[in-house]
Interface confidence: medium
């Protein structure tokens, strides 16, 4: 019996759903009555799902594993994971017996984008020429591991002096820290890119350094330039620092933050203690570092809702204050094609190619090219529509004329993410008889 | 269309120096870092340096420091490359190239023409 | 400097053969990027990142390899293909170029 499945790894984000395709084809006469259908782990042999006497004997993973019963009869033996987890990763065997008997293994490759790298500066103020200074890359909750690279502002491939790290969380996620060492010149651009192997994405940040002395007078309160850019359900820390004087004690300190444009409070400290989170019991200073000047914020299970500027007031003798952008973002799945009509095709049928992707933010840019690269503009409809998280499903479509046959793929963009996910389909009309 | 367009072949004395202009046109100057590689009678490509035409910020490979000098004139999108101090073994073809316009895409996808230098006494 | 090797410095080959180029460097490198360039002409882009065709290139060129041992292969030589192909890197500085392979008509 021959049992069909992609020669490629099936690739899943984190918290998505994945199928690993399996087929057969069955005979004439073919009752599900005869079917046995085992899904198990390759290597520890752990049974994962399984169909027998006519009935499907349900997931014995996690409860997360579904057939498709309505196809089976067809010779569809796919097997649904749902919310993958790191942990899923590796290879999963279709044992498909009726009267023979086979098999065949499917690879399940799992991915989850890497943020926006944040980046920080040690020491960040009194620079001068020839002082050196730590520049550190923070991107977060990636997998699998990233590669990093570093270049300067002529982009020059910057390697000597660099220590990157990566460590796992619980779900496996991995966060990347990667440190420069440079000297400064009389100014320079340093910048830093995080790439997912597996999903080609790419994120990077660059940072700018002007070595001069900081203005005296007011509180110098410091946020980052860029916008913080922190994925749905995840944390984000709002940074945000100031330089204590000798003598400094935590009495004399009040820090408030609020959203810039209602005034809305959301955190505060005052009286030499943290008054707590006004917004939504989600938010968090960092009380251990408020004296040596660090006012950032955690804000934790970021929603689509929580966009935009925040300020951060510092007020000890002086008073200052500076806004922080939050950017949130979310990952648009692989788009799924379909075709309309999909079967007895010709050269010169028009077909409706539809592209779509599921739960992004922002909006998401969409692109059509055909097998020879030339992107496809006319008689394209694209659509975006929010849910009630605010998660954009996007729904693109194509109407052709039919050549003799032709690919035709889709990409779907964040551009905040700078995430790309594309689907394609290949065409291939019969001739006319 | 994307092009670049250099000056035409020059013939130079040992010791004098030669400068080459490279004409961008077909896409926004100052977006891309320009580079300049030579190659040799029969020999192989050896890269030069580059510049970002944004800010005039140049790279140079050590070989060439001190006797090379890379500059730009946004107001016209063209970059030129100085070679001073002149040997027998400067006698090329020297190209301008386009690096990959994404900040990390370290090759080079548009070439130009390439200019012939001739060294001769 | 990181140094690329390129082997064999030439090779002939018929049309609609397979033919099969290497580039080795003397450190590990992130990517390589591969020129195709004939005479009297500039180089052009081929490959970059290792594996990716650049805009035009036909696709019986691919790339592959990781660290310090890279390939490139043309399933199918055709008449045009009959040219000298450089590998680059530029992962650490200076960039630098492999000698060169030429394909010569068999």
């Known amino acids: 019996l021959e049992v069909q499945v992609p020669e490629d790894p099936v690739v899943a984000l984190v918290g998505t759903d994945a199928t690993l395709c399996c087929s057969f084809s069955p005979e004439p006469g073919f009752s599900l009555a005869q079917l046995n259908l085992i899904w198990q782990l390759t290597d520890t042999k752990q049974l994962v799902h399984s169909f027998a006497e006519g009935q499907d004997q349900g997931s014995a993973y996690a409860n997360r594993t579904a057939l498709f019963p309505d196809l089976l009869a067809q010779g569809n033996a796919s097997l649904r994971l749902q919310r993958v987890r790191v942990a899923d990763e590796g290879s999963f065997t279709c044992f498909v017996s009726i009267r023979d008997f086979g098999s065949a293994a499917v690879s399940l490759q799992v991915a989850a984008p890497y943020s926006k790298p944040s980046m920080t500066l040690e020491p960040n103020k009194d620079l001068r020429p020839g002082d050196t200074v730590t520049i550190t890359c923070s991107s977060y909750q990636g997998y699998p591991e990233a590669e990093v690279f570093w270049q300067d502002g002529q982009g020059v491939p910057l390697t000597g002096n660099v220590t990157t790290s990566q460590m796992a969380n619980e779900q496996g996620l991995f966060d990347v820290h990667s440190i420069l060492r440079v000297v400064l010149g009389a100014n320079g651009t340093y910048s830093c890119l995080v790439r997912n192997p597996v999903l080609q994405q790419d994120a990077h940040s660059s940072v700018t350094i002007t070595p001069q002395r900081s203005p005296t007078g007011a509180v110098e309160v410091q946020v980052p330039e860029d916008p913080v850019v922190a994925l749905v359900g995840t944390d984000a820390t709002l940074r945000c620092s100031f330089s204590p004087e000798p003598g400094f004690s935590l009495a004399q300190l009040n820090l408030i933050w609020q959203l810039t444009d209602t005034k809305q409070l959301v955190h505060s400290f005052t009286e030499g203690r943290d008054q707590g989170s006004a917004y939504a019991n989600r938010t968090a200073l960092f009380p251990d570092l408020l004296a040596q000047g660090n006012a950032s914020l955690r804000l934790q299970r970021v929603r689509v809702a929580d966009e935009g500027s925040f300020t951060c007031f510092v007020s000890i003798r002086d008073f200052g204050s500076a806004a922080v952008s939050l950017q949130v973002a979310a990952p648009y799945s692989k788009p799924s094609m379909t075709l309309e009509p999909n079967k007895d095709l010709r050269p010169g049928d028009t077909v409706t190619i539809t592209c779509s992707s599921y739960r992004g933010y922002p909006e998401a840019e969409v692109f059509w090219q055909d097998g020879q690269g030339v992107p496809l503009t006319g008689n394209v409809t694209t659509s975006q529509m929010a849910n009630e998280q605010g998660l954009f499903d996007v729904h693109s479509v194509l109407r052709v004329v039919l050549g003799a046959n032709g690919t035709y793929s889709c990409l779907v963009r964040n551009p905040v993410l700078q995430q790309d996910a594309h689907g394609s389909v290949t065409i291939t009309g019969q001739p006319m008889t | 269309e994307v092009q670049l367009v250099q000056s035409g072949a020059e013939v130079k004395k040992p010791g004098a120096s030669v400068k080459v202009s490279c004409k961008a046109s077909?896409?926004?100057?100052?977006?891309?870092?320009m580079h300049w590689v030579r190659q040799a009678p029969g020999q192989g490509l050896e890269w030069m340096g580059g510049i970002n035409p944004n800010q005039g910020g140049t790279t140079y490979n050590q070989k060439f420091k001190g006797r090379v000098t890379m500059t730009r004139d946004t107001s016209i999108s063209t970059a030129y490359m100085e070679l001073s101090r002149l040997r027998s073994e400067d006698t090329a073809v020297y190209y301008c190239?386009?690096?990959?316009?994404?900040?990390?895409?370290?090759?080079?996808?548009?070439w130009g023409q390439g200019t012939t230098v001739t060294v001769s006494s | 400097d990181i140094q690329l090797t390129q082997s064999p410095s030439s090779l002939s080959a018929s049309v609609g053969d397979r033919v099969t180029m290497t580039c080795s460097a003397s450190s590990s490198v992130s990517y390589m990027h591969w020129y195709q360039q004939k005479p009297g002409k500039a180089p052009k882009l081929l490959i970059y990142d290792t594996s990716k065709l650049a805009s035009g290139v036909p696709s019986r060129f691919s790339g592959s390899g990781s660290g310090t041992d890279f390939t490139l292969t043309i399933s199918s030589l055709q008449p045009e293909d009959f040219a000298t192909y450089y590998c680059q890197q530029w992962s650490s500085a200076p960039l630098t170029f492999g000698g060169g392979t030429k394909v010569e008509i068999k």
């Open positions: 077909g896409y926004t100057f100052t977006e891309y870092i």
């Open positions: 190239a386009r690096k990959g316009k994404d900040y990390f895409d370290w090759y080079f996808d548009v």
